[in-house]
Structure formats: structure tokens, C-alpha cells
């Protein structure tokens, strides 16, 4: 025998109190699949969380973070404070990157400058707290007898901190 509740579409629930009639989800609740016996309570975006997408009867609300914060975790389960470029977030708040490291984003950690000499190249542009060094041609390429100059290698693509 087919379960009568299987006929209830998303956005409704199978109401046992009313002879298994498909009743609409009440306000602030949803069912994203058919055949549900209850509707789930919608997520509330409170405090540092901000509503990005309101709950509908078939889909949960989605939150993001208020200005000055960014999302972390699956489905933006946490909001983490932004820092300025050239800083990283520590337990004591935002701290400047130490000499020899940089951060070109408002999130994530300070990372060491690229070591140009490991690739046999010279430093074309010095690094800062906000920017990586730019490596230039190798010293051999700059010798008087060299007929051409190889284009500078692109700066290393910065990694992204986990979302």
C-alpha cells in the first residue's frame, strides 16, 4: 500500500492530526522534499549574521555576515572578524604581519614572501606587509652578453583561507 504522505509535495507536511491531509508549512518553517511528516524550523540570521536569502516554504534561509566579518564553515556557520590587508587575526585581535610575511586579503594568515633565489631569480620589487615580492630575471639574464631579457615570472597566486 502506498503511503498517503508520499503525495505531499515540498512546502507541505503530512498532518496526522487531520487524516494525513497535506497542510502548508506554517510561517518560519519549510520542507524541501515531499512526503515529510513535519516542517523544519527556518534558520534565523541573528546578531552578526545577516539574511542573504529568506526562508521559503520549500527552502531554508541562508545567512551571510554583517560588514566587518566574513563567513566560515559550511553554510556560513560562523562569522569571523575581518582584518586589514597586511594583518592576520590572532586570539588578541588583528595584528600586523611580521617582517618577511604578507597578507593581501582581509582574512587568512600572513604568508612568507616568495624566495626568489630558490628559482635562481632576483627580487624585482620588494615585498610589503600587503604584497608579495615580485621576482625578476635571474642574475645571469642581466649579464652584458645576454641578447634578450626573459619576462618576469608572475607573482605566486595567493592561497585562500578555508571558507
Amino acid at each position: 500500500l502506498q503511503d498517503p504522505c508520499s503525495n505531499c509535495p515540498a512546502g507541505t507536511f503530512c498532518d496526522n492530526n487531520r487524516n494525513q491531509i497535506c497542510s502548508p508549512c506554517p510561517p518560519n518553517s519549510f520542507s524541501s522534499a515531499g512526503g515529510q511528516r513535519t516542517c523544519d524550523i527556518c534558520r534565523q540570521c541573528k546578531g552578526v549574521f545577516r539574511t542573504r536569502k529568506e526562508c521559503s516554504s520549500t527552502s531554508n534561509a541562508e545567512c551571510d555576515c554583517t560588514p566587518g566579518f566574513h563567513c566560515l564553515g559550511a553554510g556560513c556557520s560562523m562569522c569571523e572578524q575581518d582584518c586589514k590587508q597586511g594583518q592576520e587575526l590572532t586570539k588578541k585581535g588583528c595584528k600586523d604581519c611580521c617582517f618577511g610575511t604578507f597578507n593581501d586579503q582581509k582574512r587568512g594568515i600572513c604568508r612568507p614572501w616568495t624566495n626568489c633565489s630558490l628559482d635562481g631569480k632576483s627580487v624585482l620589487v620588494n615585498g610589503t606587509k600587503e604584497r608579495d615580492v615580485v621576482c625578476g630575471p635571474s642574475p645571469a639574464d642581466l649579464s652584458p652578453g645576454a641578447s634578450s631579457v626573459t619576462p618576469p615570472a608572475p607573482a605566486r597566486e595567493p592561497g585562500h583561507s578555508p571558507q
Epitope: P26, P27, N28, K53, E54, S56, S57, T58, A61, E62
Partner: antibody
């Protein structure tokens, strides 16, 4: 910034129908409910119904089920309310307002006058 | 439908005074109540959501309290711009309903 733009006034004859508009801007139209609220002169607010532009979910106040039809045009980020078989009792200010539960942004309202 | 009763219909106060508005629901609605004010010829504006949660951009003199069936909106020191109509609204069940409103007027 979030804005809901409504025409200032509509004049229609008894028995006719009218389609009121509410153009949304400053946010993702498909992510937030649009509600419609009626207010007769000197009277309280009366909730007509709402629509979720992302999937056309609607909820209606039973008093307006045969009177009002809510639709949206996603391409222009505009919500509409069609009112049929108009009588003098339908003369009122009609507001559109954004929100799933609490209504956080409101249009300026359209004054509908039903008169011969 | 859930009936919201607001009392009194009219409140007369002087600027600087504290004032409280009452909203009573016909059944238990938890904290699913929201408060608005509406100035003459203006649109309603959300003041408090979910009984007590503040709204960005709304002055801190507005506060809300209550749960179940009895709710209160308070203004701790009324300013001239606060003289308006005040409405409560429930979002506990369809259809959403509004209270009949309380008019705040200058004494």
C-alpha cells in the same frame, strides 16, 4: 539601498480590475518575500498576502482570496497585485513590503480610488 | 485568525516622558510579534522584531518585551518625531494580522 517603488495613485471604475505594481531595487529580488498590505483611510493595516519571487510560493488572507492575485516578473524585479471586481470598499492605500516575518522595507503606497 | 488587541486607542504624553504600548494576542504566539510606527501620510516603519530585537537605524530609545500573549513596546524618552500611530503584527501563523493601532499624541 533597498527601495520599493509604487505608483502614487490609480483611479478605476466600479466593476473593473486593476494591477498594482511594486518595483524592487537594491537587493536580490528572488531572495526576499514581498507582502501586500491594505489601509483604508483612518483604519488599521490589513495583510492581504505575500509571494516569494524565488519560486512563486504565495500565501493569502482568506478575506482576499477571491479579490487579489499576486504575481512577480523576475526579469524586471517587479511584484504585482491584481484586484478584481472593484467596489468602493476597495478604495484604500495599498503598500508592498519586503520580509518573511517582520516587514523591514515598505513602498510609499498606491492610493486606489474606485469611483464612477 | 489570531486577533491582536492594542490598548489604549490613544495615548497622550509630553515630550521627554516614558511611554508604553500594549499588544495582546488571542493565543500564545511565542515572540513572533513585530512593532511598527506610521507617521501621518507616511509608510509604516519596522521598529522592533521578534518582540525585543532591535532594528539597525532605529533609535535606542525604542525597546520591546513580552512573550506568549502579552507584549509591550516602550519609548524611554518621547521625542517630537515619535508622535505617530503604532501597530503590532504577528507572524506566528497565516494570515499575518495587525493590531488595531495606538495613536501617540502630544499632551
Amino acid at each position: 539601498q533597498v527601495q520599493l517603488q509604487q505608483p502614487g495613485a490609480e483611479l478605476v471604475k466600479p466593476g473593473a480590475s486593476v494591477k498594482l505594481s511594486c518595483k524592487a531595487s537594491g537587493y536580490t529580488f528572488t531572495n526576499f518575500w514581498i507582502n501586500w498590505v491594505k489601509q483604508r483611510p483612518g483604519q488599521a493595516l490589513e495583510w492581504i498576502g505575500n509571494i516569494y519571487p524565488g519560486n512563486d510560493n504565495t500565501n493569502y488572507n482568506g478575506n482576499f482570496k477571491t479579490k487579489a492575485t499576486l504575481t512577480v516578473d523576475r526579469s524586471s524585479s517587479t511584484a504585482y497585485m491584481h484586484l478584481s471586481s472593484l467596489t468602493s470598499k476597495d478604495s484604500a492605500v495599498y503598500y508592498c513590503a519586503r520580509g518573511q516575518l517582520g516587514l523591514d522595507y515598505w513602498g510609499q503606497g498606491t492610493t486606489l480610488t474606485v469611483s464612477s | 485568525d489570531i486577533l491582536l488587541t492594542q490598548s489604549p486607542a490613544i495615548l497622550s504624553v509630553s515630550p521627554g516622558e516614558r511611554v508604553s504600548f500594549s499588544c495582546r494576542a488571542s493565543q500564545n504566539i511565542g515572540t513572533t510579534i513585530h512593532w511598527y510606527h506610521q507617521r501621518t501620510n507616511g509608510s509604516p516603519r519596522l521598529l522592533i522584531k521578534f518582540a525585543s530585537e532591535s532594528i539597525s537605524g532605529i533609535p535606542s530609545r525604542f525597546s520591546g518585551s513580552g512573550s506568549g500573549t502579552d507584549f509591550t513596546l516602550s519609548i524611554n524618552s518621547v521625542e517630537s518625531e515619535d508622535f505617530a500611530d503604532y501597530y503590532c503584527q504577528q507572524s506566528n501563523s497565516w494570515p499575518f494580522t495587525f493590531g488595531s493601532g495606538t495613536k501617540l499624541e502630544i499632551k
